[in-house]
């Protein structure tokens, strides 16, 4: 950090300001040195003596050039659902962030105050919007022709396999089951397939575009910390 060379306090010229890394002391009516990050003012300046700075004690810090009488206390230790991404030092506060599989439900200036587990979409529902550091997963019901058979915070709805002959039709939570003749896997939810008789296809004949059409938007789940809603599980 930039070094501050000690000097006798001085009265600024009329219309002039103190230099950078200095402050105007109203009592002394002098420009005085600030203390560097990691320090605080032990003794304030006078007309004849400059600020006396001292190092911050353990578990306290100052991040900025300052003339505060006491250093700030570092935040409390990170909770079990958090990881410490920045340790408490004399120059910086501890920063806690959410561990994988969790998101920040209540943030603070730096890091996170409260973490919550990412919502898991139950079978029949897939991830519409993945979780981020600061937002929960949004689940949606699997559209016709797609399914999800997992309880997951990452799995999306996948297309049913296309059967030459269907043994068991697929639904929102289960893939189609084909008879012993080898199936051809649909490549994408909206893939267009060659026409064939209805009886030889999976349960749905019309490819469905993703994301699903307007009526299913009512199933989008709210953001933020909330009790498990339809399509999600707290497990």
């Amino acid at each position: 950090l930039p070094a501050q060379v000690a000097f006798t306090p001085y009265a600024p010229e009329p219309g002039s300001t103190c230099r950078l890394r200095e402050y105007y002391d109203q009592t002394a009516q002098m420009c005085c040195s600030k203390c560097s990050p990691g320090q605080h003012a032990k003794v304030f300046c006078t007309k004849t003596s400059d600020t006396v700075c001292d190092s911050c004690e353990d578990s306290t810090y100052t991040q900025l050039w300052n003339w505060v009488p006491e250093c700030l206390s570092c935040g409390s230790r990170c909770s079990s659902d958090q990881v410490e991404t920045q340790a408490c030092t004399r120059e910086q506060n501890r920063i806690c962030t959410c561990r994988p599989g969790w998101y920040c439900a209540l943030s603070k200036q730096e890091g996170c105050r409260l973490c919550a587990p990412l919502r898991k979409c139950r079978p029949g529902f897939g991830v519409a919007r993945p979780g981020t550091e600061t937002s929960d997963v949004v689940c949606k019901p699997c559209a016709p022709g797609t399914f999800s058979n997992t309880t997951s915070s990452t799995d999306i709805c996948r297309p049913h396999q296309i059967c030459n002959v269907v043994a068991i039709p697929g639904n929102a939570s289960m893939d189609a089951v084909c008879t012993s003749t080898s199936p051809t896997r649909s490549m994408a939810p909206g893939a267009v397939h060659l026409p064939q008789p209805v009886s030889t296809r999976s349960q749905h004949t019309q490819p469905t575009p993703e994301p699903s059409t307007a009526p299913s938007t009512s199933f989008l789940l709210p953001m933020g910390p909330s009790p498990p809603a339809e399509g999600s599980t707290g497990d």
């Epitope: 950090l1 930039p2 070094a3 060379v5 000097f7 001085y10 600024p12 010229e13 002039s16 300001t17 103190c18 230099r19 950078l20 890394r21 990050p37 991040q63 900025l64 050039w65």
Partner: antibody
Framework: QVQLQQSGAELARPGTSVKLSCKAS????????MQWVKQTPGQGLEWIGA????????RYIQKFKGKATLTADKSSSTAYMQLSSLASEDSAVYYC???????????WGQGTSVTVSS | QIVLTQSPAIMSASLGERVTITCTAS???????LHWYQQKPGSSPKLWIY???NLASGVPARFSGSGSGTSYSLTISSMEAEDAATYYC?????????FGAGTKLELK
Amino acid sequence: QVQLQQSGAELARPGTSVKLSCKASGYTFTSYWMQWVKQTPGQGLEWIGAIYPGDGDSRYIQKFKGKATLTADKSSSTAYMQLSSLASEDSAVYYCARDGNYYAMDYWGQGTSVTVSS
Amino acid sequence: QIVLTQSPAIMSASLGERVTITCTASSSVSSTYLHWYQQKPGSSPKLWIYSTSNLASGVPARFSGSGSGTSYSLTISSMEAEDAATYYCHQYHRSPPTFGAGTKLELK
């Protein structure tokens, strides 16, 4: 390594405003003052002011009060200078420079050329 | 404010020649806060000498600086082609910081 990346050249009409940026990397942005300097062929190098991104404290010389406004965005480590009510005499190259030991400007941006013309 | 006067404004020097550029302050300046910058056409200034006599990183040892009070100087012991540039002195002993008008050093 420390780098200061300034925004591209500006061509502006008299009376309008421009906002120049200076993106810092390679050091703790909030711990160092960022200074701004104007350079013209006639006037040479002229200090405009400085900002401390840590707390937003800013200083200006009298001549540039009301002309220049310094801001800083901690999240993107970027310092900004807005120049308002532009006139032909504001045409210059503007530099951002980091305040280092003993108030020496130890790292400089590449400069942004501002041309004010009708 | 403190006015810095550089001399000469322009000068030419031959390869190997000793070069001295001076910077005179209108009032006394602490040597700690007197600096020099080098600038080449189309480039930004570079810190060259800080606190009167300390060479910035990468500056060749043929450069030196000295002075106190109101009189400061930058010296090149043996001019080289790459030294052709404009040199500025700068003070931040008191606000506002000020610069000299520059000395343009050309290769003869």
